[in-house]
Interface confidence: low
């Protein structure tokens, strides 16, 4: 028996369902009584889900997994993982045994989009050219960790005096805070881009300083 899985990682959004595809080619006359199917975590060998002795043995992993019982006889051994969490990320191995056996591993990459950044300015009044200001760009609840880029109004990257911190909450999602310290020109726009490298999702925020008032 030959097991086939996706070569590419499966990307799943947090709180959505993911399908880890696994298939085999059943011989003519194959019946489910012959099938032993085991899904496990590749690294720890922890059992995730199994089908043995002609029946679905159920989920051994947070009660959030399911097979596709009607499709098993056709060679579809895929696993459905419900309400994906950050901690589900990793490699899963699909073992199929009929007379002989084969296995293959598929990677699950968890992702969550970042929120539109909020921009704050300190100080936020009595601003004059030559003043040093601190602009903070904050974006929330993303995964994995973000890449943060700053640009001025002409699109020129601002790399000096940037400090970015990222902190995971109890769900493993990251809140990103990036601080730019800059000397004000006569007027200017400062843009922050928060990129999720897995989703290739960009979230933009900007602040324009033209004397008073400020535009966010």
């Amino acid at each position: 028996v030959e097991v086939q899985v996706s070569e590419d990682p499966v990307v799943a959004l947090v709180d959505t369902d993911a399908t880890l595809r696994c298939s085999f080619s059943p011989e003519p006359g194959f019946s489910l009584a012959q099938l032993n199917l085991i899904w496990q975590l590749t690294d720890t060998k922890q059992l995730v889900h199994s089908f043995t002795e002609g029946r679905d043995q159920g989920s051994a992993y947070s009660n959030r997994t399911a097979l596709f019982p009607d499709l098993l006889v056709q060679g579809n051994a895929s696993l459905r993982l419900q309400r994906v969490r950050v901690t589900d990320e990793g490699s899963y191995t699909c073992f199929v045994s009929i007379q002989d056996f084969d296995s293959a591993a598929v990677s699950l990459q968890v992702a969550a989009p970042y929120s539109k950044p909020s921009m704050t300015l300190e100080p936020n009044k009595d601003l004059r050219p030559g003043n040093m200001v601190t602009i903070t760009c904050s974006s929330y609840q993303g995964y994995p960790e973000a890449e943060v880029f700053w640009k001025d109004g002409q699109g020129v990257p601002l790399t000096g005096n940037v400090t970015t911190s990222q902190m995971a909450n109890e769900r493993g999602l990251f809140d990103v805070h990036s601080v730019l310290r800059v000397v004000l020109g006569a007027n200017g726009t400062y843009s922050c881009l928060v990129r999720n490298p897995v989703l290739q999702q960009d979230a933009h925020g900007s602040v324009t300083i033209t004397g008073q008032p400020l535009t966010f």
Partner: antibody, heavy 122, light 108 residues
Amino acid sequence: EVQLLESGGDLVQPGGSLRLSCAASGFNFSSYWMSWVRQAPGKGLEWVSGISISYGGNAYYADSVKGRFTVSRDNSKNTLYLQMNSLRAEDTAVYYCGRDRSPYQYRSMDVWGQGTTVTVSS
Amino acid sequence: EIVLTQSPGTLSLSPGERATLSCRASQSIRSDLAWYQQKPGQAPRLLIYGASSRATGIPARFSGSGSGTEFTLTISSLQSEDFAVYYCQQYNNWPPLTFGGGTKVEIK
């Protein structure tokens, strides 16, 4: 410049302990899987341990060091560690830290430190 | 664990010659293989990943091929700086990540 710099190698007696450090610079350390790889004198490369970026930082070990070595990372300090306990003569080697080629994956290592030498001998 | 067997152990060639290094896996690793170069007293350097993709800054004379269990690293025309030890490494099935025993390319 992307750089890894190991330290902490020393001469230690069998049964002793040592902690190696690997200081990273020039890249977003917290986004990359990291590994420790060693090379005994005149021998080939042997993967020792790896640590993920995932929530909780999953750690992985070669059978030869499991239960004796502990890998950890401090993303706030951009530093990777290897705590080595119950050291044996066969642990004598140059220890390298390596960074995975691309963020969020564990595959091949494109950035290596210069290595730090651990000698276990009485 | 997956065992990688490299051959030959030593390859004696002259500058300008073509070098062909082999790496065999104990079971299929699809294309999940990397090649490294190591010179005496230095850290390894990544040459090839994904069996055939050149790493950043690696000259075109280095090429990788193969999938499943049989892999080849080819250096089309050896330069003086290419004489070194070459290792293959698999990342299809881990832990552990495993390396081959190495092939030394020396000057004839």
